[in-house]
């Protein structure tokens, strides 16, 4: 079943920098922003790097990598728990190759990979192993109890063999940004609704504060007008019906908003912001109790 909507009185959140949500396949029009937005366009225009992309960092841990290829050195970061995020445009998949590994599997060391269709734990036979994500984002988390231990990774990206996405789907990266729901256009197929994916740095959580208007009265059937927000890690899903101010917080660094077909047909609108919050629980928690919430 779906969760109970989280609602707060309408109060202005600290205004984050803006990222305008652009549909997949549309031309990119950038607003002045710190956040980053990708579409499947072959060469998306880039903004200046935000704080999560700073090329000079003392540790690999906590970074969000948005370049097409890169090397991630998670050896000896000085912390037992280290996570990095990799993000690419919709329509691409992330490939990961383990160049070096000194994880001690019998001591409980491990590599955890997760994304929209991936929840993988691995340790044995890692060297030279190549892993391909099923979608355009991947969080890599390393648990290593021995100082100086860890993995050296090379990541790349390539076009997905099949498209998991719809024309009107959108992707937002970066620590904060503007959320604008897609609008129904005759040229775009909106069958099944449209989705907005938000990915932030791996140890952050996402807060969403937005106003939904013109939602219409339809709450059931094919023309039901609603917004679903789903935490990609815990799979906790919250449904929002009707005109309202909505506030939602994730438990992890990845969220998925779904605007129903009825929402689009009603020419409903959602406008607001997302920003990051400090994580109160490391994603995937301790590997021995890597549970998450099973129900949705």
């Amino acid at each position: 079943g779906q969760g109970t909507p989280s609602l707060v009185p309408h109060e202005e959140a600290a205004a984050p920098g803006r990222t305008t949500a652009t549909p997949a396949g549309a031309s990119l029009e950038w607003s002045q922003a710190r956040g980053l937005l990708f579409s499947p366009a072959p060469q998306p225009r880039r903004l200046l790097p935000g704080p999560q992309e700073n090329s000079v960092q003392s540790s690999a841990c906590g970074r969000q990598h948005l370049e097409p290829t890169g090397t991630i050195d998670m050896r000896g970061p000085g912390q037992a728990d280290c996570a990095v995020a990799i993000g690419r445009p919709l329509g691409e998949v992330v490939t990961l190759r383990v160049l070096e590994s000194s994880l001690n599997c019998s001591a409980g060391d491990m590599l955890l990979l997760w994304g929209r269709l991936t929840w993988r734990k691995m340790c044995r036979k890692l060297l030279d192993m190549t892993f391909s994500s099923k979608t355009n984002t991947l969080v890599v988390r390393q648990r290593c109890g021995r100082p100086g231990g860890g993995v050296l990774l090379r990541y790349g990206s390539q076009l997905a063999p099949e498209t998991f996405y719809r024309e009107c789907d959108m992707q937002l990266f970066g620590p904060w940004g503007e959320i604008v729901s897609p609008s129904l256009s005759p040229a775009t197929s909106n069958a099944g609704g449209c989705r907005l994916f938000i990915n932030v740095a791996p140890h952050a959580r996402i807060a969403i504060h937005a106003l939904a208007t013109n939602m219409g009265a339809g709450t059931e059937g094919a023309n039901a007008s609603y917004i679903l927000i789903r935490d990609t890690h815990s799979l906790r899903t919250t449904a929002f019906h009707g005109q309202q101010v909505l506030y939602w917080e994730s438990e992890s660094s990845q969220a998925e908003m779904e605007f129903s077909e009825g929402f689009l047909k009603a020419q409903a609108s959602l406008r607001g912001q997302y920003w990051t919050l400090q994580s109160w629980v490391p994603e995937m928690q301790d590997p021995q109790s890597w549970k998450g919430k099973e129900g949705t």
């Epitope: 099923k134 799979l235 021995q288």
Partner: antibody, heavy 122, light 107 residues
């Protein structure tokens, strides 16, 4: 090559118990979630239960909740289903299925065994 | 619990035909839908995951589409080995549920 071999099925009276086993080979067993899916004779498929790689999370279909218990022994590359208080409607071919992911809530089944038949009848 | 329905429940077709099977969920499941093929006396086989992604080793004549509540499995040119039953299954939320199946037999 991934192989899943179920055993432990048979004829049992209503109210009695049975324990199914699934022996896995050809993959790193403790990296993956596992599931039991059943199919009544001439009927469709029904998910019964799932267990994550480290037994940290477990789920059951409403129809078996409180009666069936899923477990795994990673050292033995084995999956189990303890079935208590069996009913006639539990009669089915029980398949052991591998998940492509480590958490059972992934809910996909990329490799299946050939099944073991459980018949509940007096 | 999420209900899955399939249509048609059975169909007769000839080798070379284009075959379409539809699956509907009782509420939106985004793209969290899988398709399986099952031949008599055999275990099911995963064909499509995430509504449209082809499982490794599955012939490209199989394709999946749809999102939200309505999904389609298409076999572009039916081959003799494709005569079987086909099931959709949602992996959006527990308990995971299957459609009742569609049997494809020879015309």
């Amino acid at each position: 090559e991934v192989q899943l071999l179920e055993s432990g099925g048979g004829l049992v009276q209503p109210g009695r118990s049975l324990r199914l086993s699934c022996a896995a080979s050809g993959f790193i067993f403790d990296d993956y979630a596992m599931h039991w899916v059943r199919q009544a004779p001439g009927k469709g498929l029904e998910w019964v239960s799932g267990i994550s790689w480290n037994s940290g999370s477990i789920g059951y279909a409403d129809s078996v909740k409180g009666r069936f218990t899923i477990s795994r022994d990673n050292a033995k590359n084995s999956l189990y289903l303890q079935m208590n208080s069996l009913r006639a409607e539990d009669t089915a071919l029980y398949y052991c299925a591998k998940d492509p992911n480590s958490l059972y809530r992934s809910g996909s089944f990329d490799y299946w065994g050939q099944g073991t038949l459980v018949t509940v009848s007096s | 619990e999420l209900q899955m329905t399939q249509s048609p429940s059975s169909l007769s077709a000839s080798v070379g035909d284009r075959v379409t099977i539809t699956c509907r969920a009782s509420q939106s499941i985004s793209s969290y839908l899988n398709w399986y093929q099952q031949k008599p006396g055999k275990a099911p086989k995963l064909l499509i995951y995430a509504a449209s992604s082809l499982e490794s080793g599955v012939p490209s004549r199989f394709s999946g589409s749809g999102s939200g509540t309505d999904f389609t499995l298409t076999i572009s040119s039916l081959q003799p080995e494709d005569f079987a039953s086909y099931y959709c299954q949602q992996s959006y939320s527990t308990p995971f549920t299957f459609g009742p199946g569609t049997k494809v037999d020879i015309k």
